[in-house]
Protein backbone atom coordinates (compact mmCIF):
# COMPACT_ATOMS: atom_id res chain seq x y z
CA UNK A 1 0.00 0.00 0.00
CA UNK A 2 1.27 3.46 -0.90
CA UNK A 3 0.78 5.95 1.95
CA UNK A 4 -1.60 8.77 1.06
CA UNK A 5 0.30 12.03 0.63
CA UNK A 6 -1.22 15.48 0.84
CA UNK A 7 -0.62 17.95 -2.01
CA UNK A 8 2.15 19.68 -0.10
CA UNK A 9 3.95 16.43 0.75
CA UNK A 10 3.66 15.32 -2.91
CA UNK A 11 5.21 18.58 -4.07
CA UNK A 12 8.01 18.41 -1.49
CA UNK A 13 8.89 14.80 -2.31
CA UNK A 14 9.81 15.81 -5.90
CA UNK A 15 12.67 17.96 -4.55
CA UNK A 16 15.75 16.82 -2.58
CA UNK A 17 15.74 17.14 1.20
CA UNK A 18 15.90 20.74 2.41
CA UNK A 19 14.20 22.04 -0.72
CA UNK A 20 10.58 22.49 -1.81
CA UNK A 21 8.94 22.79 -5.21
CA UNK A 22 8.14 26.30 -6.42
CA UNK A 23 4.34 26.75 -6.20
CA UNK A 24 4.12 28.43 -9.64
CA UNK A 25 6.82 26.45 -11.46
CA UNK A 26 7.19 22.77 -10.65
CA UNK A 27 10.56 22.56 -12.42
CA UNK A 28 12.17 24.76 -9.75
CA UNK A 29 13.26 23.53 -6.33
CA UNK A 30 13.76 26.31 -3.78
CA UNK A 31 15.78 26.03 -0.58
CA UNK A 32 13.63 25.89 2.54
CA UNK A 33 13.92 28.61 5.19
CA UNK A 34 15.92 27.92 8.36
CA UNK A 35 14.14 27.59 11.70
CA UNK A 36 13.50 31.02 13.18
CA UNK A 37 12.61 32.38 9.74
CA UNK A 38 9.65 32.18 7.34
CA UNK A 39 9.12 32.37 3.58
CA UNK A 40 8.76 35.94 2.35
CA UNK A 41 9.29 35.22 -1.37
CA UNK A 42 9.98 32.01 -3.30
CA UNK A 43 13.31 31.74 -5.11
CA UNK A 44 13.09 33.37 -8.56
CA UNK A 45 14.89 30.53 -10.33
CA UNK A 46 17.09 27.41 -9.95
CA UNK A 47 20.14 27.99 -7.76
CA UNK A 48 18.82 31.37 -6.61
CA UNK A 49 18.15 32.23 -2.98
CA UNK A 50 14.77 31.94 -1.28
CA UNK A 51 13.81 35.19 0.44
CA UNK A 52 13.46 34.24 4.11
CA UNK A 53 12.77 36.74 6.89
CA UNK A 54 13.24 36.37 10.63
CA UNK A 55 10.15 35.76 12.72
CA UNK A 56 8.84 38.79 14.53
CA UNK A 57 8.56 38.99 18.30
CA UNK A 58 5.79 36.73 19.59
CA UNK A 59 6.19 34.20 16.79
CA UNK A 60 8.51 31.30 15.89
CA UNK A 61 9.31 28.43 13.53
CA UNK A 62 10.99 25.41 15.16
CA UNK A 63 12.19 23.64 12.01
CA UNK A 64 13.14 24.35 8.41
CA UNK A 65 10.03 25.36 6.54
CA UNK A 66 8.37 27.24 3.71
CA UNK A 67 5.58 28.76 5.80
CA UNK A 68 4.19 32.12 4.74
CA UNK A 69 3.84 33.16 8.38
CA UNK A 70 5.59 32.24 11.60
CA UNK A 71 3.56 30.43 14.26
CA UNK A 72 2.21 32.38 17.22
CA UNK A 73 3.98 31.68 20.52
CA UNK A 74 1.97 29.65 23.01
CA UNK A 75 0.91 31.28 26.25
CA UNK A 76 1.07 29.35 29.51
CA UNK A 77 -2.40 28.90 30.94
CA UNK A 78 -2.60 30.58 34.34
CA UNK A 79 -6.09 29.15 34.92
CA UNK A 80 -4.50 25.68 34.70
CA UNK A 81 -1.78 26.62 37.19
CA UNK A 82 0.89 26.56 34.47
CA UNK A 83 4.11 28.56 34.75
CA UNK A 84 6.60 29.55 32.06
CA UNK A 85 9.71 27.36 32.08
CA UNK A 86 11.35 29.12 29.14
CA UNK A 87 10.27 32.04 26.99
CA UNK A 88 9.44 31.87 23.30
CA UNK A 89 12.33 32.59 20.92
CA UNK A 90 12.26 32.88 17.12
CA UNK A 91 13.12 29.19 16.81
CA UNK A 92 11.41 27.66 19.86
CA UNK A 93 7.92 27.88 21.31
CA UNK A 94 7.25 28.81 24.93
CA UNK A 95 7.80 25.90 27.31
CA UNK A 96 5.16 25.66 30.03
CA UNK A 97 5.25 23.48 33.13
CA UNK A 98 4.24 23.22 36.77
CA UNK A 99 5.73 24.50 40.02
CA UNK A 100 7.86 22.40 42.35
CA UNK A 101 5.93 19.60 44.09
CA UNK A 102 3.27 19.63 41.41
CA UNK A 103 2.53 17.27 38.50
CA UNK A 104 0.76 17.58 35.16
CA UNK A 105 -2.61 16.01 34.54
CA UNK A 106 -3.33 15.91 30.82
CA UNK A 107 -6.97 16.55 29.93
CA UNK A 108 -6.02 16.06 26.29
CA UNK A 109 -2.84 15.71 24.23
CA UNK A 110 -2.10 19.45 24.43
CA UNK A 111 -3.93 20.62 27.54
CA UNK A 112 -2.57 19.97 31.01
CA UNK A 113 -3.42 21.25 34.47
CA UNK A 114 -1.06 21.44 37.45
CA UNK A 115 -2.00 19.66 40.68
CA UNK A 116 -0.17 19.39 44.00
CA UNK A 117 1.61 16.09 44.59
CA UNK A 118 -0.06 13.94 47.23
CA UNK A 119 1.80 13.85 50.56
CA UNK A 120 0.51 10.37 51.51
CA UNK A 121 -0.76 11.41 54.95
CA UNK A 122 -1.82 8.26 56.87
CA UNK A 123 0.26 6.23 54.42
CA UNK A 124 3.68 5.90 52.83
CA UNK A 125 5.08 6.95 49.46
CA UNK A 126 5.15 3.94 47.15
CA UNK A 127 6.27 5.90 44.06
CA UNK A 128 7.49 9.49 44.17
CA UNK A 129 5.68 12.27 42.32
CA UNK A 130 6.77 12.57 38.68
CA UNK A 131 6.39 15.30 36.08
CA UNK A 132 3.26 13.65 34.64
CA UNK A 133 2.13 11.43 37.51
CA UNK A 134 1.01 11.98 41.08
CA UNK A 135 2.68 10.27 44.03
CA UNK A 136 1.49 6.68 44.46
CA UNK A 137 0.54 6.09 48.10
CA UNK A 138 0.21 2.93 50.17
CA UNK A 139 -2.16 3.42 53.11
CA UNK A 140 -1.62 2.40 56.72
CA UNK A 141 -3.92 -0.18 58.30
CA UNK A 142 -7.35 1.29 58.98
CA UNK A 143 -7.17 3.51 55.92
CA UNK A 144 -8.07 3.02 52.27
CA UNK A 145 -7.03 4.82 49.07
CA UNK A 146 -9.61 7.17 47.55
CA UNK A 147 -8.54 9.54 44.78
CA UNK A 148 -4.94 8.96 45.92
CA UNK A 149 -5.59 10.04 49.50
CA UNK A 150 -5.62 7.75 52.51
CA UNK A 151 -9.09 7.97 54.02
CA UNK A 152 -10.16 6.47 57.35
CA UNK A 153 -12.07 3.18 57.08
CA UNK A 154 -14.79 4.81 59.20
CA UNK A 155 -15.72 6.60 55.94
CA UNK A 156 -16.08 3.31 54.05
CA UNK A 157 -19.66 2.55 53.02
CA UNK A 158 -20.71 -1.02 52.24
CA UNK A 159 -21.44 -0.17 48.61
CA UNK A 160 -17.91 1.07 47.91
CA UNK A 161 -14.86 -0.90 46.75
CA UNK A 162 -13.08 -0.10 50.02
CA UNK A 163 -15.07 -2.83 51.80
CA UNK A 164 -12.41 -5.46 50.99
CA UNK A 165 -9.60 -3.30 52.40
CA UNK A 166 -11.64 -2.24 55.41
CA UNK A 167 -13.40 -5.55 56.06
CA UNK A 168 -12.20 -6.00 59.69
CA UNK A 169 -13.25 -2.42 60.56
CA UNK A 170 -16.67 -2.85 58.94
CA UNK A 171 -17.19 -6.14 60.80
CA UNK A 172 -16.29 -4.38 64.06
CA UNK A 173 -18.67 -1.50 63.40
CA UNK A 174 -21.44 -3.98 62.51
CA UNK A 175 -20.67 -6.00 65.64
CA UNK A 176 -20.83 -2.87 67.83
CA UNK A 177 -24.18 -1.92 66.31
CA UNK A 178 -25.54 -5.45 66.87
CA UNK A 179 -24.37 -5.59 70.50
CA UNK A 180 -26.24 -2.35 71.16
CA UNK A 181 -29.61 -3.94 70.32
CA UNK A 182 -31.37 -6.35 72.61
Amino acid sequence: LVPHLGDREKRDSVCPQGKYIHPQNNSICCTKCHKGTYLYNDCPGPGQDTDCRECESGSFTASENHLRHCLSCSKCRKEMGQVEISSCTVDRDTVCGCRKNQYRHYWSENLFQCFNCSLCLNGTVHLSCQEKQNTVCTCHAGFFLRENECVSCSNCKKSLECTKLCLPQIENVKGTEDSGTT
Epitope: W107, S108, N110, L111, Q113, F115, E147, N148
Partner: nanobody
Protein backbone atom coordinates in the same frame (compact mmCIF):
# COMPACT_ATOMS: atom_id res chain seq x y z
CA UNK B 1 -27.83 6.57 21.39
CA UNK B 2 -26.07 9.04 23.71
CA UNK B 3 -28.37 10.87 26.10
CA UNK B 4 -27.58 13.53 28.71
CA UNK B 5 -30.50 14.76 30.76
CA UNK B 6 -30.01 17.73 33.09
CA UNK B 7 -32.29 18.58 36.02
CA UNK B 8 -32.29 20.72 39.16
CA UNK B 9 -32.45 24.20 37.66
CA UNK B 10 -34.86 26.85 38.84
CA UNK B 11 -35.30 30.28 40.38
CA UNK B 12 -33.12 31.06 43.39
CA UNK B 13 -32.29 34.20 45.35
CA UNK B 14 -28.76 35.66 45.37
CA UNK B 15 -26.66 33.84 47.96
CA UNK B 16 -28.77 30.70 47.58
CA UNK B 17 -27.83 27.19 46.47
CA UNK B 18 -28.87 24.69 43.82
CA UNK B 19 -27.73 21.21 42.88
CA UNK B 20 -27.81 20.23 39.23
CA UNK B 21 -27.84 16.59 38.09
CA UNK B 22 -27.12 15.01 34.74
CA UNK B 23 -28.21 11.46 33.97
CA UNK B 24 -26.05 9.91 31.26
CA UNK B 25 -26.72 6.90 29.02
CA UNK B 26 -25.62 5.40 25.73
CA UNK B 27 -21.86 5.48 26.40
CA UNK B 28 -19.34 4.27 29.00
CA UNK B 29 -19.80 7.12 31.46
CA UNK B 30 -17.12 5.91 33.90
CA UNK B 31 -14.40 6.21 31.23
CA UNK B 32 -15.14 9.78 30.17
CA UNK B 33 -14.15 13.23 31.40
CA UNK B 34 -17.42 15.13 31.87
CA UNK B 35 -18.16 18.84 32.09
CA UNK B 36 -20.67 21.57 32.80
CA UNK B 37 -20.89 24.50 30.41
CA UNK B 38 -23.27 27.44 30.56
CA UNK B 39 -24.76 30.08 28.32
CA UNK B 40 -25.97 33.34 29.82
CA UNK B 41 -28.72 35.25 27.95
CA UNK B 42 -27.26 36.85 24.81
CA UNK B 43 -23.77 35.46 25.48
CA UNK B 44 -21.60 32.62 24.19
CA UNK B 45 -20.93 29.25 25.79
CA UNK B 46 -18.59 29.29 28.80
CA UNK B 47 -16.72 26.47 30.55
CA UNK B 48 -17.89 26.06 34.14
CA UNK B 49 -16.17 22.92 35.35
CA UNK B 50 -15.01 19.46 34.34
CA UNK B 51 -14.07 16.26 36.13
CA UNK B 52 -11.85 13.28 35.27
CA UNK B 53 -13.33 9.76 34.85
CA UNK B 54 -12.72 8.69 38.45
CA UNK B 55 -13.23 12.13 39.95
CA UNK B 56 -9.64 12.62 41.11
CA UNK B 57 -9.07 15.74 38.98
CA UNK B 58 -11.33 18.74 38.58
CA UNK B 59 -11.16 22.11 36.86
CA UNK B 60 -13.19 25.23 37.66
CA UNK B 61 -13.49 28.50 35.77
CA UNK B 62 -12.22 31.43 37.86
CA UNK B 63 -15.75 32.88 37.93
CA UNK B 64 -17.10 29.89 39.93
CA UNK B 65 -14.01 28.74 41.86
CA UNK B 66 -14.73 28.25 45.57
CA UNK B 67 -18.52 28.41 45.06
CA UNK B 68 -19.29 25.48 42.74
CA UNK B 69 -18.37 21.81 43.23
CA UNK B 70 -18.48 19.21 40.48
CA UNK B 71 -18.82 15.53 41.38
CA UNK B 72 -19.94 12.27 39.84
CA UNK B 73 -21.39 8.90 40.80
CA UNK B 74 -20.23 6.36 38.25
CA UNK B 75 -22.44 3.64 39.75
CA UNK B 76 -25.46 5.81 38.87
CA UNK B 77 -24.05 7.29 35.62
CA UNK B 78 -24.74 10.72 37.05
CA UNK B 79 -22.85 14.02 37.04
CA UNK B 80 -23.55 16.74 39.63
CA UNK B 81 -22.92 20.45 40.08
CA UNK B 82 -23.39 21.88 43.56
CA UNK B 83 -23.78 25.65 43.24
CA UNK B 84 -23.48 27.78 46.38
CA UNK B 85 -23.38 31.55 46.98
CA UNK B 86 -25.18 32.11 43.70
CA UNK B 87 -24.98 35.51 42.02
CA UNK B 88 -27.10 37.25 39.38
CA UNK B 89 -24.28 36.70 36.86
CA UNK B 90 -24.67 32.92 37.29
CA UNK B 91 -28.05 33.15 35.53
CA UNK B 92 -27.73 30.91 32.47
CA UNK B 93 -28.76 27.66 30.82
CA UNK B 94 -26.45 24.98 32.22
CA UNK B 95 -25.48 22.06 29.99
CA UNK B 96 -23.91 18.76 30.85
CA UNK B 97 -21.41 17.82 28.11
CA UNK B 98 -18.68 15.42 27.11
CA UNK B 99 -15.93 17.96 26.44
CA UNK B 100 -13.45 18.17 23.60
CA UNK B 101 -10.31 20.18 24.38
CA UNK B 102 -8.85 20.47 20.86
CA UNK B 103 -9.86 24.13 20.64
CA UNK B 104 -9.49 25.12 24.30
CA UNK B 105 -10.23 27.76 25.58
CA UNK B 106 -13.06 27.74 23.04
CA UNK B 107 -15.93 25.59 24.29
CA UNK B 108 -16.20 22.42 22.23
CA UNK B 109 -17.90 19.10 22.95
CA UNK B 110 -18.73 15.73 21.41
CA UNK B 111 -22.28 15.92 22.76
CA UNK B 112 -24.32 17.82 25.32
CA UNK B 113 -27.76 17.73 26.92
CA UNK B 114 -30.74 20.03 26.38
CA UNK B 115 -29.82 22.17 29.38
CA UNK B 116 -31.50 23.37 32.55
CA UNK B 117 -32.22 27.04 33.28
CA UNK B 118 -30.82 28.61 36.46
CA UNK B 119 -32.20 32.06 37.30
CA UNK B 120 -30.65 34.00 40.18
CA UNK B 121 -32.87 36.92 41.09
CA UNK B 122 -34.43 38.58 44.11
Amino acid sequence: EVQLLESGGGLVQPGGSLRLSCAASGFTFAKETMSWVRQAPGKGLEWVSWISPHGAHTFYADSVKGRFTISRDNSKNTLYLQMNSLRAEDTAVYYCAKPRFSYYPRVSFDYRGQGTLVTVSS
